[in-house]
Structures are given as structure tokens and as C-alpha cells.
């Protein structure tokens, strides 16, 4: 048995007479032989579930579900109840109604075995019948909605009449009907005004019925019509077996360059017309098992279940259904030497499905694991400026298909033929398994005899000891020129273009910093800034060379504080900034401030220097001119 609603509403007035019928609660059957029996909870509750008093006023007919006043609620009773409502005005009280057989302990009130009946209290007597508006004569203030389980025996789930109105205003005639399209499974009995289902409902055919209830009021000569929505929701049960969309029960996959743990190798989709079990229970009750194979397969693969709600069309309306994606996933990184083919089977079981038929499917995955060979081009040729600064990125080396690799470890090394000319270093990029070549020793770069640098590039997969080699010829170009005195270590320090371009900084391939002019569009990824090389910094990503020293590209790598208009990077740096962003790496601070605009209206007086203490700079103090002050505050 279950209630057709989880909550009911009615009005209560002071001194309403004993015997006044209030409303009917309705139970629907889960099985044809069930007979409902109703009982009331012992207490009345108020605001925030406050237990107010034992219920001495309202009774229920156990067999019909009729609630009625068995004694009048007088003013003193209401005052007593109000006094216990934690100081809140008593506007609403509620009772719990239980469906027997249930435990006699009055605990939580949860649908389907319990419903709450709310009474809106009016500290006046019942109004004169002639003063009641048609809406008040027809329907409760709160619109009801109904829940009916699919595949259950038909039954009565609502009674239209407002019983106190019918009882206290017998001269007013009220008629009801349901507006519904052809062939809908509901009827309203004209005599009893009871609404019932004609037959068992099927949620997979229709999940929601948006009916309209029409009430016609006859009071003397006047006739008025009131219409309200009358929504019915059909509740699901597990009555559909899982199926394969388009009959596809097999997926084939090749594992080659993507060999990283957690890589999705292949996916098969299962469709289930049901939306139960609910999400909290789903993974426990809708099981998937990788059928036993050899030990290697069991260790290497796992199956992940990813359920998702979807909508399907049925009889012209949309109903919810579930698609289950079963992903075959690598459970570990695979060695590049691994080479095998296998068939895997996965058993999917909708354990709540009761039939007819089986709730079990068998999924098939055909997987080929191919070995990976390491190949480098026969040779590389690069040039580097003699003015290049330490950590300047001058090129990349990459084994064949390295951009596509994941889970494949390749370490690059440089072997120099001339010991005193070992200028370059190489680091492996975690992103694309390439090797980034960078200037590691600027002293060697400036030696006249180091005009041509010869290296052997060695790429190694340490797990298998497989290697690839290539020649690297680096030509050193240009003349070394010492930079201006007072140039910062980091290009990022410079806030203006002239001071940026006259200096070099760590990571600069040309020995000069580069100015990136922003687009000036508010907080933007394209903010103005000074960089060692706009190819790599800032690009929203702190690469493996930039991580070597915070002075190279704090715009991408800073973990400290950013002052001013900005959006922080994930996990570090400046994702977007306002105006010009400059940084003081050793202070672990960056500042994003409006572009400096010289104000022609500013006279000598306002150029006098002012001291501002800025709390948001973490105790920094800054002496700046009035025009800067104006921009700072405007910003």
C-alpha cells in the first residue's frame, strides 16, 4: 500500500464545530488483495517540526481515510498550542497519517507509508459562505500533485470536494470534472467526485500527465468556473530488461600510443528503459563483472560503469530512461614492448529486474595491444644566439608519434662531443613526451671556439631500455653584447615597453625581453606583459623549463599572490589579467593594473609624491604620483 500524495492541505478555523469533516486521504494498492487501514500519529507539530501537543482534536476513519474534527478547537486551545511553537506565530500545524500495518512508533514520516496533513490556521471563525470566492469553494490553497506507481492495480486516489465547505455551506452547489484527452487512464465519478485510475499505468509509455481539473460553482443565479492543473506522476519500477542499442554487443580497440593507466580503451552502451534503481543504489544493484580470463588481463583492465539519464520518445511524449556506458579502462601503464591480442567478456546484471526474461547481458571487447618502437629523425639542425640567456628554449626533439604518447616514459639526454662547449640542456616535457632544448651554460655559449656545437640526442625508455639516437648540430650566431646596468633578472619585472625591450632576462633566446601588447579588453588572457619569449611565455601553462626557475615566467608559474584585476591560473600563474601584469618573482607577487595613461590636465602640484599603504599588497607600500593614484583608485 502507498499514499497517492506525500502531503495534504486544509484550513482550520477557531470554533469549527465538532463533527466537521476535513478531508480524505487515499491509499493505492500494490497488490489486488491489499486493504488499507489508516491511523493518525499521536501528536500535532508546528514550525520546524516542533512537537506541540497530543492530538486531541482530529480523528480518522480507519477504513475510509476521512479526517474530521471530533472536538472543536477553541481559542484557549490554540493559545496553548501557540505558546509551544518556539515563539513563532502559529500559522500551520501538521499531523502524520500512517498506513497500517506499520510500526506503532511515530518516527520519520516518509512516503510511501506516511503522509503529512497540514492545516493552515485562521484565528477567526469560519467565514460567511457568501463571502467565499469561487477559488476558495473549489480547491485547497496548495495545488495537489499525485504519485502513482506503474503496473499496480487501479484505484481511487483523490476526492475533489472541500469537505468543510460542503458541510458548512450546503446551499452552494459545486461540480467537478477532469479535462483529459482521449484514452487517458483516469475518470472522475460524477456522484462521489472520486478520481481513480481505469487501469494499471506504464511509466515507459507516459511518465507525466498534466491534467486540468474544472470546478463549476452554482450559487443562486451565478455560475463560475475555476480551472487548476491536476498533475499526476507515474513512479517507476524495474520492469525493463537492459538491451543493446542497435544490437551492438561488441567493441574492438587497438592500444598503441595511449598506454597510460586510466585510459579508456573502448566503450559499450547498454540501454534500460527504467530509471530505477535510483542513482544512490544504481552501481550496487546494476553490476558489471569482468569475466575471469588470464592473470595479465585481470591485472591490466578494469570495467567502469557510467550511468546517465536520457530522454526517449514514447507515444508522443518524452519519458526518462537510462543509458549505461561500460568503459574498458587500463588499470596500469603498459610497457612499450607489450604485444598481444585478447577477447574480454563483461557480464552486466540488472539485479532488481524481476522478468519476464533475463536482466543479464554479455558485453564483448576485442583488444589488440601493439608494441611501440622509438625512432628519431637522422639529424637535427638548430641555431642559437650568442646573446641567449640561461633557460632560453631553442628547440624541441621528439621521437616519432611522441605527441600522441601517454603513459610512455621517454627521457632525452644530450651527449656533447666537445667537453668545453656543453652549452645546452634537455628536459622531457610531460605534456607531449618531447624533449625541450634550452641554454644551460651561457659562459660556454660566449667562447669563440664554440661556434658549432655537436651533440648526440639519445631518447630512452628506461622500462625496456629501448633507445633511439640522432645527431644534433647547433650553430651559434651573432655577437655577445653585455646588457644595460640595472636590468632585472626576470623580464616580468618590467611594467613598460621601453624598459622591457632594453633588457634581457632569464629564458630570453635573443638576449632581449619581448613586449606583448594586450588587447585591452578588461580581464583578458591577452594582457600586456614583458616576456623572455612570447612563443612560450605567458601561454597559460608553466612548462618543464619554466619550472626550473621562478624568474623565467612568473606569469605562468607564480604560486604567490596576484594583486589587481585577474583570474588565477590553474594551478598557478595568471590565467587572465587587467591591463598590464608585471611580477616580482622573488617576492612571489604579480600586479595587474590599468595601462598607464599620461593625463595632460595634471599640473605640477599633483605630481607631488604621495605615500599609499596598500593592505592588499600584503603590507607593501608604494610611492606613486597623483596620476597613478587616480588610476589606481579608478581601477
Amino acid at each position: 500500500l502507498y499514499f497517492s500524495r506525500d502531503a495534504y492541505w486544509e484550513k482550520l478555523y477557531v470554533d469549527q464545530p465538532a463533527g466537521t469533516p476535513l478531508l480524505y486521504v487515499h491509499a493505492l494498492r500494490d497488490a489486488p488483495e491489499e486493504v488499507p487501514s489508516f491511523r493518525l500519529g499521536q501528536h500535532l507539530y508546528g514550525t520546524y517540526r516542533t512537537r506541540l501537543h497530543e492530538n486531541n482534536w482530529i480523528c480518522i476513519q480507519e477504513d475510509t481515510g476521512l479526517l474530521y474534527l471530533n472536538r472543536s478547537l477553541d481559542r484557549s486551545s490554540w493559545e496553548k498550542l501557540s505558546g509551544r511553537n518556539r515563539g513563532f506565530p502559529l500559522l500551520t500545524v501538521y499531523l502524520k497519517v500512517f498506513l497500517s500495518p506499520t510500526s506503532l512508533r511515530e518516527g520519520e514520516c516518509q512516503w510511501p507509508g506516511c503522509a503529512r496533513v497540514y492545516f493552515s490556521f485562521f484565528n477567526t471563525s469560519f467565514p460567511a459562505c457568501t463571502s467565499l470566492k469561487p477559488r476558495e469553494l473549489c480547491f485547497p490553497e496548495t495545488r495537489p500533485s499525485f504519485r502513482i506507481r506503474e503496473n499496480r492495480p487501479p484505484g481511487t486516489f483523490h476526492q475533489f470536494r472541500l469537505l468543510p465547505v460542503q458541510f458548512l455551506c450546503p446551499n452552494i452547489s459545486v461540480a467537478y470534472r477532469l479535462l483529459e484527452g482521449e484514452g487517458l487512464p483516469f475518470r472522475c465519478a460524477p456522484d462521489s467526485l472520486e478520481v481513480s485510475t481505469r487501469w494499471a499505468l506504464d511509466r515507459e509509455q507516459r511518465e507525466k500527465y498534466e491534467l486540468v481539473a474544472v470546478c463549476t460553482v452554482h450559487a443562486g443565479a451565478r455560475e463560475e468556473v475555476v480551472m487548476v492543473p491536476f498533475p499526476v506522476t507515474v513512479y517507476d519500477e524495474d520492469d525493463s530488461a537492459p538491451t543493446f542499442p542497435a544490437g551492438v554487443d561488441t567493441a574492438s580497440a587497438v592500444v598503441e600510443f595511449k598506454r597510460k593507466e586510466d585510459t579508456v580503451v573502448a566503450t559499450l552502451r547498454v540501454f534500460d528503459a527504467d530509471v530505477v534503481p535510483a542513482s544512490g543504489e544504481l552501481v550496487r544493484r546494476y553490476t558489471s563483472t569482468l569475466l575471469p580470463g588470464d592473470t595479465w588481463t585481470q591485472q591490466t583492465f578494469r570495467v567502469e560503469h557510467w550511468p546517465n539519464e536520457t530522454s526517449v520518445q514514447a507515444n508522443g511524449s518524452f519519458v526518462r530512461a537510462t543509458v549505461h556506458d561500460y568503459r574498458l579502462v587500463l588499470n596500469r601503464n603498459l610497457s612499450i614492448s607489450e604485444n598481444r591480442t585478447m577477447q574480454l567478456a563483461v557480464l552486466v546484471n540488472d539485479s532488481d529486474f524481476q522478468g519476464p526474461g533475463a536482466g543479464v547481458l554479455l558485453l564483448h571487447f576485442n583488444v589488440s595491444v601493439l608494441p611501440v618502437s622509438l625512432h628519431l629523425p637522422s639529424s637535427y639542425s638548430l641555431s642559437v644566439s650568442r646573446r641567449a640567456r640561461r633557460f632560453a628554449q631553442i628547440g624541441k626533439v621528439c621521437v616519432e608519434n611522441c605527441q600522441a604518447f601517454s603513459g610512455i616514459n621517454v627521457q632525452y639526454e644530450l651527449h656533447s662531443s666537445g667537453a668545453n662547449c656543453s652549452t645546452l640542456g634537455v628536459v622531457t616535457s610531460a605534456e607531449d613526451t618531447s624533449g625541450i632544448l634550452f641554454v644551460n651554460d651561457t659562459k660556454a655559449l660566449r667562447r669563440p671556439k664554440c661556434a658549432e656545437l655537436h651533440y648526440m640526442v639519445v631518447a630512452t625508455n628506461h622500462q625496456t631500455s629501448r633507445q633511439a639516437q640522432a645527431q644534433l648540430l647547433v650553430t651559434v650566431e651573432g655577437l655577445y653584447v653585455a646588457e644595460e646596468a640595472g636590468c632585472p633578472l626576470s623580464c616580468a619585472v618590467s611594467k613598460r615597453r621601453p624598459e622591457c625591450e632594453e633588457c634581457g632576462g632569464l629564458g630570453s633566446p635573443t638576449g632581449r625581453c619581448e613586449w606583448r601588447q594586450g588587447d585591452g579588453k578588461g580581464i583578458t588572457r591577452n594582457f600586456s606583459t614583458c616576456s623572455p619569449s612570447t612563443k612560450t611565455c605567458p601561454d597559460g601553462h608553466c612548462d618543464v623549463v619554466e619550472t626550473q626557475d621562478i624568474n623565467i615566467c612568473p606569469q605562468d608559474c607564480l604560486r604567490g599572490s596576484i594583486v589587481g584585476g585577474h583570474e588565477p591560473g590553474e594551478p598557478r600563474g595568471i590565467k587572465a589579467g587587467y591591463g598590464t601584469c608585471n611580477c616580482f618573482p622573488e617576492e612571489e607577487k604579480c600586479f595587474c593594473e590599468p595601462e598607464d595613461i599620461q593625463d595632460p590636465l595634471c599640473d605640477e602640484l599633483c605630481r607631488e609624491q604621495k605615500l599609499i599603504s596598500e593592505e592588499d599588497l600584503g603590507g607593501e607600500q608604494k610611492l606613486i604620483s597623483e596620476e597613478d593614484l587616480h588610476h589606481h583608485h579608478h581601477h
Epitope: C487, P488, L489, F584, E586, E587, E588, Q621, K622, I624
Partner: antibody, heavy 123, light 107 residues
């Protein structure tokens, strides 16, 4: 030849303000490539960097977190000097205080130091 | 804050000895590292900056090495005027921090 000459009282009462000045000769307080620092030394804390001021288009100050709420370092371009103010002192602030020039852009090493001023905080 | 740990805290040596002092940083500081010498009643004096660059006017018997977290100061042949306390310092991130000092005494 750069020289730094320190001046200021050697005795300060608890809760009062410690004030020291460092006069610069042979360089400018507004120089673009250096920063002007205060450092103190005590048996309990060893050498402790307190803060700095430097000029690059604007004046900037940076302070150690341990004293940030109490410290002010001010440049004085007219007298080519810079000063330290440390508020609300306690006996813990008793130390030998040094001013020093720091090379701002090649790793901030301190190549010139003042002679030091022993400050005792006592009532 | 970056911690700087010097060892040993003191050592005894004779004139002409080769002396090595080490300093370890609590995190990678690349070469943002300096060595200072301090004699009683005097301010510290810069010996080595950027881990291995000799400050002008400092005798060539002093040399610095290391990068990352481990650094050394070597005095190739100890002279009478070298008996003093030596401090290391990092300038990678603020606050700049110093080691606790190594006192070199006459044996």
C-alpha cells in the same frame, strides 16, 4: 666607493618606536639596480632580514612577514638616505641593526653594509 | 620560509689547511645563494654571490660551489685573517634567510 652611515638611539623603551637612519654616499637611494635593506642580528635569531625599499619607476617596499605589521622603511631622496621605523617594540627586538645595499637584479646579494647600531629595548 | 642549515656549526683548523663549509636549503634555490664572512664587532662582508662568483677584492683562495639545495664554501689554504664566522644566505624568495653560521677557530 659606497659607504653607509647609520644613526639613531641605542636605547628604546618597550611599546615605543625604534627609529634608525642610513645615510648613503657613493650611490643614490633612487638607483634603479639596487635595493636598500635593513637586517638585524641577535644571539637568539641570528641574522634576520627585515625589509627593503627600492625604486623602479615607482617606490616599492617589501617586508619580512615576522615584522610586517610593525615596520616602515622610507626613502628620503633629498637627503639620499633611508630609514627604519619599528613600532611597538619588545625586549625581543633587542639586536644589532644593519643597513645594507642589495643588488636587486642578480640575486640580491648585500655588497655594502653599515657599521651596525646596537639597539636595546628596556624600560 | 626557506630554511638554511649550515654544517658544521664550528670547526678548528690550522693555517694552511683546506677548509670546507656546507649549507643546505630546505628547497631548490638554483644559484640564488651567497656566502658572507663576519669578524667580531664588524658587519658581515660578501665573499661569494650567485653560488660561485667571487666578489671583487676577495682573495682567490675562497671558492663556492653547488646548485639547487646543496652548497659549499672552500678555503683552499687557510690564512690567519680567515678566522671568523661564515654565513650562507638564500635570495630565491622573500624573506631572504641566512644560515646559523659556522665559526672557524684556530686549532
Amino acid at each position: 666607493q659606497v659607504q653607509l652611515q647609520q644613526s639613531g638611539p641605542g636605547l628604546v623603551k618597550p611599546s615605543q618606536t625604534l627609529s634608525l637612519t642610513c645615510a648613503i654616499s657613493g650611490d643614490s637611494v633612487s638607483s634603479n639596480s639596487v635595493a636598500w635593506n635593513w637586517i638585524r642580528q641577535s644571539p637568539s635569531r641570528g641574522l634576520e632580514w627585515l625589509g627593503r625599499t627600492y625604486y623602479r619607476s615607482n617606490w616599492y617596499n617589501t617586508y619580512a612577514v615576522s615584522v610586517k605589521s610593525r615596520i616602515t622603511i622610507d626613502p628620503d631622496t633629498s637627503k639620499n638616505q633611508f630609514s627604519l621605523q619599528l613600532n611597538s617594540v619588545t625586549p625581543e627586538d633587542t639586536a644589532l641593526y644593519y643597513c645594507a645595499r642589495g643588488h636587486r637584479y642578480s640575486g640580491s646579494y648585500f655588497d655594502y653594509w653599515g657599521q651596525g647600531t646596537l639597539v636595546t629595548v628596556s624600560s | 620560509d626557506i630554511q638554511m642549515t649550515q654544517s658544521p656549526s664550528s670547526l678548528s683548523a690550522s693555517v694552511g689547511d683546506r677548509v670546507t663549509i656546507t649549507c643546505r636549503a630546505s628547497q631548490n634555490i638554483n644559484s640564488y645563494f651567497n656566502w658572507y664572512q663576519q669578524k667580531p664587532g664588524k658587519a658581515p662582508k660578501l665573499l661569494i654571490y650567485a653560488a660561485s662568483s667571487l666578489q671583487s677584492g676577495v682573495p682567490s683562495r675562497f671558492s663556492g660551489g653547488g646548485s639547487g639545495t646543496d652548497f659549499t664554501l672552500t678555503i683552499s689554504s687557510l690564512q690567519p685573517e680567515d678566522f671568523a664566522t661564515y654565513y650562507c644566505q638564500q635570495t630565491y624568495t622573500i624573506p631572504w634567510t641566512f644560515g646559523q653560521g659556522t665559526k672557524v677557530e684556530i686549532k
